[in-house]
């Protein structure tokens, strides 16, 4: 039985050219996290595997950095980065948990800084 829940940063916004941390946290389960996949819509961004460490998709290497922890840092943001991001936790023995984050990248310098994981 899957008892865990994924907590995410939810809906967040950031300024064009800036950086943001995408963060998910799995709680309420003793399942072992074997791998976390990060996806943007239909693109695999990065994978963090308990044995193999991080793999960043080559096409995102310049703008995506691993961490902190199982999170993902997006840099040099553009308006095209606006959209849904998913953290997919592969666990044993529970199975798969998925969290969703919506990022809005704003042209303006008055982007709301509501996310506690945001990089200034």
């Amino acid at each position: 039985m899957m008892t865990g829940t994924i907590e995410t940063t939810g809906n967040i916004s950031a300024e064009k050219g800036g950086s943001i941390i995408l963060q998910c946290h799995l709680s309420s389960t003793t399942a072992q996290v074997t791998q976390v996949n990060w996806e943007q819509q239909d693109q695999l961004l990065a994978i963090c595997n308990a044995d193999l460490g991080w793999h960043i998709s080559p096409s995102f290497k310049d703008r995506v950095a691993p961490g902190p922890g199982l999170g993902l840092t997006l840099q040099s943001l553009t308006v095209n980065d606006t959209g849904e991001y998913f953290c997919i936790y592969h666990t044993y023995p529970d199975g798969t948990y998925t969290g969703r984050i919506f990022l809005e990248v704003l042209e303006s310098s008055v982007a709301e800084h509501g996310a506690r994981f945001q990089i200034p």
């Epitope: 074997t34 695999l44 595997n49 023995p93």
Partner: antibody, heavy 118, light 107 residues
Framework: EVQLLESGGGLVQPGGSLRLSCAAS????????MHWVRQAPGKGLEWVSG????????SYADSVKGRFTISRDNSKNTLYLQMNSLRAEDTAVYYC???????????WGQGTLVTVSS | DIQMTQSPSSLSASVGDRVTITCRAS??????LNWYQQKPGKAPKLLIY???SLQSGVPSRFSGSGSGTDFTLTISSLQPEDFATYYC?????????FGGGTKVEIK
């Protein structure tokens, strides 16, 4: 250099059993998921089974479920496929494969031929 | 199970030609799509993983694109050593499934 060397193939009668082995070297075997993929003569590739890095999780194609068992011994750097109740349609070259991040197959063995025939 | 449909099943081309092979999934597989090359009597070789990432050591004339359900493998300028059979494979969910293959032959 990564190497995967399969063994254990051969001729077996329908209903018989075989145990395939795959000896791995050149990498940290215990860190990688491993899979078996087969190819019938003149046909395409068919996934058979996979196992997680620590052996805790396994999965099978419907065509072999209940007949084949995948296992691994990380202390011996070896992957196994126990094949029971073999059928003519199991005749194929069986490849052992390394699967980083459980997403792509980056290394394949040379394959071992299993022939099921009376 | 996710079905992978590859087309064409075979094609004839000349050295220097641009070759395109397509692969369609029966449901969305995000970018969990890999491409392999196989020559007769040999094990398959990874070309492209995660839809568009070029495997280390593979010539840059090979490229992959697509996401969701539709994917493409392109060989920008076919070389003599590229005549082989190409397979797509999804790793979105088990059972992992392969396309039926595309045999690239010399015209």
């Amino acid at each position: 250099e990564v190497q995967l060397l399969e063994s254990g193939g051969g001729l077996v009668q329908p209903g018989g059993s075989l145990r395939l082995s795959c000896a791995a070297s050149g990498f940290t075997f215990s860190s990688y998921a491993m899979h078996w993929v087969r190819q019938a003569p003149g046909k395409g590739l068919e996934w058979v089974s996979g196992i997680s890095s620590n052996g805790g999780s396994t999965s099978y194609a419907d065509s072999v479920k209940g007949r084949f068992t995948i296992s691994r011994d990380n202390s011996k750097n070896t992957l196994y496929l126990q094949m029971n109740s073999l059928r003519a349609e199991d005749t194929a070259v069986y490849y052992c494969a390394r699967v980083p991040y459980s997403v792509w197959i980056d290394y394949w063995g040379q394959g071992t031929l299993v022939t099921v025939s009376s | 199970d996710i079905q992978m449909t590859q087309s064409p099943s075979s094609l004839s081309a000349s050295v220097g030609d641009r070759v395109t092979i397509t692969c369609r999934a029966s449901q969305s597989i995000s970018s969990y799509l890999n491409w392999y090359q196989q020559k007769p009597g040999k094990a398959p070789k990874l070309l492209i993983y995660a839809a568009s990432s070029l495997q280390s050591g593979v010539p840059s004339r090979f490229s992959g694109s697509g996401s969701g359900t539709d994917f493409t493998l392109t060989i920008s300028s076919l070389q003599p050593e590229d005549f082989a059979t190409y397979y797509c494979q999804q790793s979105y969910s088990t059972p992992l499934t392969f396309g039926g293959g595309t045999k690239v032959e010399i015209k």
